[in-house]
């Protein structure tokens, strides 16, 4: 009896694992084995596929074959007993295109009201993703074990901290990877659960803010108790993107080590241009808090988000305000290469009733003013980037008198 060729061959590639599955064509024939050949693009000859010769089951693994994952490959299969079936050819494919991202490896760290998630690719030193290692982003689903209400967090990197959790509560999560450059979404990791600890005696510092004064940065935060000492650390923000189980080398800000106030001042030249993460910790000598939430700090935006400079042209019923670039020390204008929104506050000099205008344009009309009346104006700039969400301080108020009633044109 002629052996029939196997049918419905499926190629599954997850990370560096290459798995073939197929259907037997004739279940009634026993002791049949199966063998595969492969052929690379531009080659005429077929080569035996190691790991997939004389297989008795309907599944084989050819991960040991060192393939160029960007090169097209063709496979064929046949059944063998005393004789052999004809070859069945599988549609050619490119391993990289076909590959799925496997489940990432996840480690969890618990605090009282936070969980740190360390994520690394499931396959160490993967050949498939060798050129894309730095491009992985992750997303996760987290829920309280008791409620099951899920929250999704997108676009995170290899270290992510989730805050504002409840103490002594079990949280569960699963993580998947994505390579947005290749439109690939990975497989979820197994579910990992961890219980947050009992509430710590000392809470972490809160509401950390950075501002610029003269040539210094001023870092301020809030704290519940008095007579504490604080320390501040920084980390390059890009390091969070590093793949694998990275060592995060948080560094001390020397002027912010063991400070006894809820602020510290340090020179701008402590930081080169870049984006940093900052965190603060409190101690009373016996106990130490967990670290505060990490805030993102962009030196360019911090240093250069100075209050806008503006000129007022006074008419009888309005002001025309022309907003210019703020001046650095030395009177040179600051080039701002990110979009800003301007908030303009104005009020009658004799009143406290303030009115507000929000404008993207740099020439703004303040309408509905009374003639021959003194109005004061102040302005500040906001970045339009939601993530950075920074504001300058207000400019000094400038007061001008409107013209008499017939000069509106």
């Amino acid at each position: 009896k002629n052996l029939k060729s196997p049918q419905k061959v499926e190629v599954d590639i997850i990370d560096d694992n290459f798995i073939l599955r197929w259907n037997r064509s004739d279940e009634s024939v026993g002791n049949v084995t199966f063998s595969f050949d492969y052929q690379k693009t531009g080659m005429d000859n077929w080569i035996k596929l190691s790991g997939c010769q004389n297989i008795t089951s309907t599944k084989c693994n050819f991960s040991s074959l060192k393939l160029n994952v960007y090169e097209e490959i063709k496979l064929r299969i046949r059944a063998e007993k005393e004789n052999t079936s004809s070859w069945y050819e599988v549609d050619s494919f490119t391993p990289f295109r076909k590959a799925q991202i496997g489940p990432p490896e996840v480690h969890l760290e618990a605090e009282d009201k936070a969980i740190v998630i360390h994520i690394s690719p499931g396959t160490k030193d993967s050949v498939m993703w060798a050129l894309d290692g730095l491009s992985f982003t992750y997303s996760l689903v987290i829920w309280k074990n008791s409620s099951g209400v899920e929250e999704r967090i997108e676009n995170i990197y290899s270290r992510h901290k989730i805050y504002k959790l409840s103490p002594e509560t079990t949280y569960c999560l699963k993580v998947k990877a994505a390579l947005l450059t290749s439109w690939k979404i990975g497989v979820y990791s197994p579910v990992h659960c961890i219980k947050t600890t009992v509430e710590n005696e000392l809470p972490p510092p809160e509401n950390i803010e950075v501002s610029v004064q003269n040539q210094n940065y001023v870092l301020k935060w809030d704290y519940t108790y008095a007579n504490m000492t604080f320390q501040v650390q920084w980390l390059h923000a890009f390091l969070k993107r590093n793949p694998g189980n990275h060592l995060y080398k948080w560094k001390q800000i020397p002027d912010c080590e063991n400070v006894k106030t809820t602020q510290c001042v340090f020179p701008q030249n402590v930081f080169q241009k870049g984006i940093y993460l900052l965190r603060v910790q409190a101690s009373d000598g016996n106990n130490t808090s967990f670290w505060s939430e990490e805030i993102k700090f962009d030196t360019e935006i911090q240093a250069f988000l100075l209050p806008p400079v503006f000129n007022i042209r006074s008419l009888s019923d309005s002001f025309h305000i022309y907003i210019g670039a703020p001046k650095q020390s030395g009177n040179t204008p600051v080039i701002q290469d990110y979009p800003l929104i301007y908030e303009i506050i104005f009020w009658e000099n004799t009143s406290n009733a303030e009115r507000k205008i929000i404008e993207k344009k740099t020439d703004v009309t303040v309408p509905n003013l009374k003639p021959l009346t003194v109005y004061c104006v102040k302005a500040r700039a906001h970045t339009m980037d939601e993530k950075l969400n920074k504001s300058s301080v207000f400019s000094d108020a400038v007061c001008e008198k409107t013209k008499p009633g017939n000069t509106s044109k």
Partner: antibody, heavy 119, light 107 residues
């Protein structure tokens, strides 16, 4: 393969100083923190301090401030522990160890260097 | 400094038994706790990190648990090669501190 090779045993006189070395292979010490730990005979482990070889930043346990100085030479992939004003209390085995990931405290240890302080 | 207390200096067990070594921190250290095994005449070897994760190559009979201030290293189905001293360590806050150690003796 990660390995930490420590210098040989030392017999030193009270009041003198000694400098121990820990040479690493299989990884770059710049990417790690290098720690030193003391263990006296039949006693527990005491953390002395650590260095970030990338920039030389150090942290010490208060007890060893002034007693120990940790340095590193990235060109030879070596960390050092110098102990000053030695007394019999400093007689111990000293281990170097590396921290290679934020997940771990330390993941690899050297074989230890025995220091004996005796006149 | 955070004090790590291993209340039992010695523990006696038999091959095949299950034994639990405990460690208490003087303040909340989250899950930043490691366990080390030190056999006689050898340097310490990492067994557990982040309170509950096994280092590569460590047999599955070793499990770590706990968070906050109370931590446990459990060895199920104790083998003769587990004869050693076990140390806990917190790495949440500098200076890092070790427990005093628990010597496991095989009957």
């Amino acid at each position: 393969e990660v390995q930490l090779q420590q210098s040989g045993a030392e017999l030193v006189k009270p009041g003198a100083s000694v400098k121990l070395s820990c040479t690493s292979s299989g990884f770059n010490i710049k990417d790690s923190y290098m720690h030193w730990v003391k263990q006296r005979t039949e006693q527990g482990l005491e953390w002395i301090g650590r260095i970030d070889p990338e920039d030389g930043e150090t942290k010490y346990a208060p007890k060893f401030q002034g007693k120990a100085t940790i340095t590193a030479d990235t060109s030879s992939n070596t960390a050092y522990l110098q102990l000053n004003s030695l007394t019999s209390e400093d007689t111990a085995v000293y281990y170097c160890a590396r921290r290679g990931s934020s997940l771990y405290a330390v993941d690899y240890w050297g074989q230890g260097t025995s220091v004996t302080v005796s006149s | 400094d955070i004090v790590m207390t291993q209340s039992q200096k010695f523990m006696s067990t038999s091959v095949g038994d299950r034994v639990s070594v405990t460690c208490k921190a003087s303040q909340n250290v989250g899950t930043s706790v490691a366990w080390y095994q030190q056999k006689p005449g050898q340097s310490p070897k990492a067994v557990i990190y982040l309170a509950s994760y096994r280092h590569r190559g460590v047999p599955a009979r070793f499990t770590g648990s706990g968070s906050g201030t109370d931590f446990t290293l459990t060895i199920s189905n104790v083998q003769s090669e587990d004869l050693a001293e076990y140390f806990c360590q917190q790495f949440n806050i500098y200076p890092w501190t070790f427990g005093g150690g628990t010597k496991l003796e095989i009957k």
